[in-house]
């Protein structure tokens, strides 16, 4: 039986930070898991992975490329991210993995969220220089 | 029996303008057919449309939003999308249906493709007015 | 039918690295459903679980060899591997690949196991 | 992690025997009334061979005087009338935690 999971559809984030909720259909603190995110239409790319369970919040380890942390209670993840530039736009899907004890269970993949990080664009005006 | 669908997993634009190819696992020219673009994680907004057969080349049309036109050969219909602008980055996905004859055929939910439309910043700089 | 077979053992050097593989016949790795666990057991001694890698490609590994250790696999090959670092005496063994389902995670199928013995 | 203790370490009988051979956790491994604790049999140069399965469910192929029960902490494995094949090694193992634990074996040998 798959667990579902729901996430917001986009987040535009002009600063260079966001927080992304992963709502899931199952409580978290019922058997050890193993959260991440996961970036690109194929998921390519693992952006951010925590385990966990009842007994101790989970460390959180990012992909070279990125920044991450990570929080939940009984039925959200939430993964942020920092340091993000415009080429991190992309679409991130939430996944979660519940392995101990058994049996294994994992999420249907859900539609993802599209993060467009806007560009920062600051127009010096050009100050002739003093002699 | 469902079509496959392939598309590029993102397009970055510079320009305002984008060619989205759709190719499919079967062949156009054997029914009449419908293609249209999606935007959104859930495919919220038919972006544009085309309705085409072996005997004539479709007529696009696309939602208000957006500028569109298509085109199509045996396997492939491309999608060209102008005048966009920062906001239309987001996931597209490529939907074809087979009409007649029967039997109805569709295709299987792609991964879609991601467009992101980069902004283009142009700094003036400020020229004191003459008196 | 499902088969396991590992290959790679052999002699190596103290402060070494190996790499064992599994090639897995009868059943894909990166489908739903299955597991593959590595085992190992000294001359004479117990057994003694190393770590295992899910369809999905998640890990997890045994505290006492996390630092050393590497599982991961070819999809396109059927066929897991495992690596581990900074040899030592006590790492000699039979090496085994076991595949485990999703609902219990009991170990049904087995490989013929591969020795490593190190030492200069 | 979760210790397994398994008793006797050895012991020794006859074809036709009934033998008793015990595994204790440190901890129980019971989840939704499953007992995620199994049962290998493994005879000198071969790889192990799964015997029984949560607890109590014999693996398909094995022969019936095969058999395991308990829950929580405390499970048995049981051959009704031990034969000349079943001199071996005999491992329980838990999965209801990681790291996935070993009891440290029983030997059965003929006396």
């Known amino acids: 039986n798959k667990i579902l999971v729901k996430q917001s559809p986009l987040l535009v984030v002009d600063s260079n930070e966001v927080s992304l909720s992963c709502r899931y259909s199952y409580n978290l603190l019922a058997k050890e898991f193993r959260a991440s995110l996961y970036k690109g239409v194929n998921s390519d790319v693992e952006v951010c992975v925590g385990n966990g369970n009842f007994t101790y919040q989970p460390q959180f380890r990012s992909n070279a490329e990125f920044n991450c942390d990570g929080d939940f209670d009984n039925e959200t993840v939430t993964f942020r991210l920092w340091n993000l530039h415009v080429n991190h736009t992309d679409i991130y899907f939430c996944k979660i993995e519940f392995m101990y004890p058994p049996p294994y269970l994992d999420n249907e993949r859900s539609n993802g969220t599209i993060i467009h990080i806007k560009e920062k664009h600051l127009c010096h005006t050009q100050s002739s220089p003093k002699l | 029996n469902k079509i496959l669908v392939k598309q590029s997993p993102l397009l970055v634009v510079d320009s305002n303008e984008v060619s989205l190819s759709c190719r499919y696992s079967y062949n156009l020219l054997a029914k009449e057919f419908r293609a249209s673009l999606y935007k959104g994680v859930n495919s919220d907004v038919e972006v544009c449309v085309g309705n085409g057969n072996f005997t004539y080349q479709p007529q696009f049309r696309s939602n208000a939003e957006f500028n569109c036109d298509g085109d199509f050969d045996n396997e492939t219909v491309t999608f060209r999308l102008w005048n966009l602008h920062v906001n239309h980055t987001d996931i597209y996905f490529c939907k074809i249906e087979f009409m007649y004859p029967p039997p109805y055929l569709d295709n299987e939910r792609s991964n879609g493709t991601i467009i992101h439309i980069k902004e283009k910043h142009l700094c003036h700089t400020q020229s004191s007015p003459k008196l | 039918e499902v088969q396991l077979v590992e290959s790679g053992g052999g002699l190596v050097q103290p402060g070494g690295s190996l790499r064992l593989s599994c090639a897995a016949s009868?059943?894909?790795?990166?489908?739903?459903?299955?597991?593959v666990s590595w085992i190992r057991q000294a001359p004479g001694k117990g057994l003694e679980w190393i770590g295992e890698?899910?369809?999905?490609?998640?890990?997890y590994y045994s505290p006492s060899l996390k630092s050393r250790v590497t599982i991961s696999r070819d999809n396109s090959k059927n066929t897991l591997y495992l690596q581990l670092n900074s040899l030592r005496a006590e790492d000699t063994a039979v090496y085994y690949c076991a595949r485990y389902e999703y609902y219990y995670y009991d170990f049904d199928y087995w490989g013929q196991g591969t020795l490593v013995t190190v030492s200069s | 992690d979760i210790q397994l203790t398994q008793s006797p370490s050895s012991l020794s009988a006859s074809v036709g025997d009934r033998v008793t051979i015990t595994c204790r956790a440190s901890q129980s491994v019971d989840f939704h009334g499953i007992s995620f604790l199994h049962w290998y049999q493994q005879k000198p140069g071969k790889a192990p061979k799964l015997l029984i399965y949560a607890a109590s469910s014999l693996q398909s192929g094995v022969p019936s005087r095969f058999s395991g029960s308990g829950s929580g902490t405390d499970f048995t494995l049981t051959i009704s009338s031990l034969q000349p094949e079943d001199f071996a090694t005999y491992y329980c193992?838990?999965?209801?935690?990681?790291?996935?634990?070993f009891g440290q074996g029983t030997k059965v040998e003929i006396k």
């Open positions: 890698i899910y369809h999905s490609g998640s890990t």
């Open positions: 009868g059943f894909s790795l990166s489908t739903g459903g299955v597991g």
């Open positions: 193992q838990q999965s209801y935690r990681s790291p996935r634990t």
